[in-house]
Interface confidence: low
């Protein structure tokens, strides 16, 4: 017995984080010779029977979850993983700082603090140069970032966003960039650690204190690395899980 039609991939170009009024293209990619594509916005009646959706100017109403599938003959493929399209610049930018400072010795520890004047309960941190994150919504509820040994791979420019779990696809503008400098090392690891983090991070309602920890576990499709945080849930042994399903993840 041959298997089902394989699921297509769905990606946002140039990024799934889209500033308001900026363009983005959603592209559904299946095998050659597809008869029909269907690209839809979940939790709405919007869909189109085309592989590419060009959005010339991002709007709040267009943020959300998207999924696609394709048809060959009478058969429909399995659905793509969900893509979550985020509108940024909806709220004022938070501030990003490093504790004890933005210069850290190799092997030392550093904590990045993302702070907002709003009562937001969610924060996202990402490193410049990585592809924009393709996130899984459950991760808005994961505040699990262990202290790790900093390496040269952690050097770079960081920004953070803040937003509310009530509107997880509407983010603030990015913070001003923070340059993290790792001193006393000359070797850059060829790859990052892959062990998932354990739940240790805690912070107050409007302040996210994140120990820098990049693993392939945090929301990623290719080589992107991004981390998010939210208040710790002590009754959840595995760390908080998202309250609704939207895979696009």
């Amino acid at each position: 017995q041959s298997g089902p039609l394989p699921k297509p991939s769905l990606q946002a170009l140039p990024s799934s984080l889209v500033p308001l009024e900026k363009p983005v293209t959603l592209r559904c990619q299946g095998p050659p010779g597809v008869d029909l594509y269907r690209l839809e916005k979940l939790s709405s009646s919007r869909y189109q029977d085309q592989a590419v959706l060009f959005i010339p100017a991002m709007k709040r109403s267009l943020a959300g979850r998207y999924r696609c599938s394709y048809q060959n003959g009478s058969l429909w493929s399995l659905p793509s993983d969900q893509l979550e399209l985020v509108a940024t610049g909806v709220f004022a930018k938070p501030s990003l700082s490093a504790q004890p400072g933005p210069a850290v010795s190799s092997g030392g520890d550093v904590t990045l603090q993302c702070q907002t004047r709003y009562g937001f309960d969610q924060f996202a941190l990402y490193k410049e140069g990585d592809p924009a994150p393709y996130k899984n919504p459950e991760r808005w509820y994961r505040a699990s970032f262990p202290i790790i040994t900093v390496t040269a791979a952690h050097s770079g420019t960081y920004r953070c966003y803040s937003f509310s779990s009530r509107d997880p696809y509407l983010w603030s503008a990015p913070s001003d960039p923070l340059e993290l400098v790792v001193t006393g090392t000359s070797v850059t690891p060829s790859r990052l650690p892959t062990e998932p983090p354990s739940p240790v991070a805690e912070f107050s309602e409007a302040t996210a204190e994140l120990t820098v920890s990049f693993t392939n576990e945090v929301f990623t499709t290719e080589t992107s690395r991004s981390i998010t945080a939210s208040p710790k849930e002590s009754d959840s042994p595995a760390g908080p899980a998202r309250q609704y399903y939207t895979k696009g993840n």
């Epitope: 298997g3 979940l42 429909w76 991760r139 595995a238 609704y244 399903y245 939207t246 895979k247 993840n249």
Partner: antibody
């Protein structure tokens, strides 16, 4: 050929933890997700949770406080851990591939009893 | 969470006959429904996904239809090997099974 095989302890004492391993072959865990489903005696199927190809997880809301799903891509294994077991957790536990669960294991029977 | 109400919970039919099972979702699931056959001692088998797409190797006497909140699954030309319990599954938002329908042959 796609295959999934569950392995578990068989018997677990109340209030203890349950750990089950799903070993897969014929597909990559970096691309496909794996679900966990159970069936209590003489009852229907119940979805427990899922781990996606990129490592993210989804859990049934009533179980998420005591459920954890993880995986080891290099060993082609997915792990289910459930804490604070009661006799209501007695069931046959299945792992199944991705959405909408096109391939299933045969299941492993778990009895919660003292 | 989305609830799936499956009916009937059991039914009996004759060889060569036709049976229909229905599932009603508590909200619009946008055709993201699958149907499974489950026999004792085995893992469930996926028959249909996305409302009406038959899995490769599944006989065409199995069919599915529906939209919005209401979906149905039918077996025509019933065969003795069709004795099993059948489940619907929504996968639009989390995953939820229907309660199951036990099919017996008269």
């Amino acid at each position: 050929q796609v295959q999934l095989q569950e392995s578990g302890p068989g018997l677990v004492a109340p209030s203890q933890s349950l750990s089950i391993t799903c070993t897969v072959s014929g597909f990559s865990l970096t691309y496909y997700g794996v679900n966990w489903v159970r069936q209590p005696p003489s009852r229907g199927l119940e979805w427990l949770g899922m781990i996606w190809g990129d490592g993210s997880t989804d859990y049934q809301s009533t179980l998420k406080s005591r459920l954890s799903i993880s995986k080891d891509n290099s060993k082609s294994q997915v792990f289910l851990k459930m804490n604070s077991l009661t006799t209501d957790d007695t069931a046959r536990y299945y792992c199944a591939r991705d959405l909408p669960m096109d391939y299933w294991g045969q299941g492993t029977s778990v009895t919660v009893s003292s | 969470d989305i609830q799936m109400t499956q009916s009937p919970s059991s039914l009996s039919a004759s060889v060569g006959g036709r049976v229909t099972i229905t599932c009603k979702a508590s909200q619009d699931i946008n055709k993201y429904i699958a149907w499974y056959q489950h026999k004792p001692g085995k893992g469930p088998s996926l028959l249909i996904h996305y409302t009406s797409t038959l899995q490769p190797g599944v006989p065409s006497r199995f069919s599915g239809s529906g939209s919005g909140r209401d979906y149905s699954f039918s077996i025509s030309n019933l065969q003795p090997e069709d004795i099993a319990t059948y489940y619907c599954l929504q996968y639009a938002n989390l995953l939820t099974f229907g309660g199951g329908t036990k099919l017996e042959i008269k």
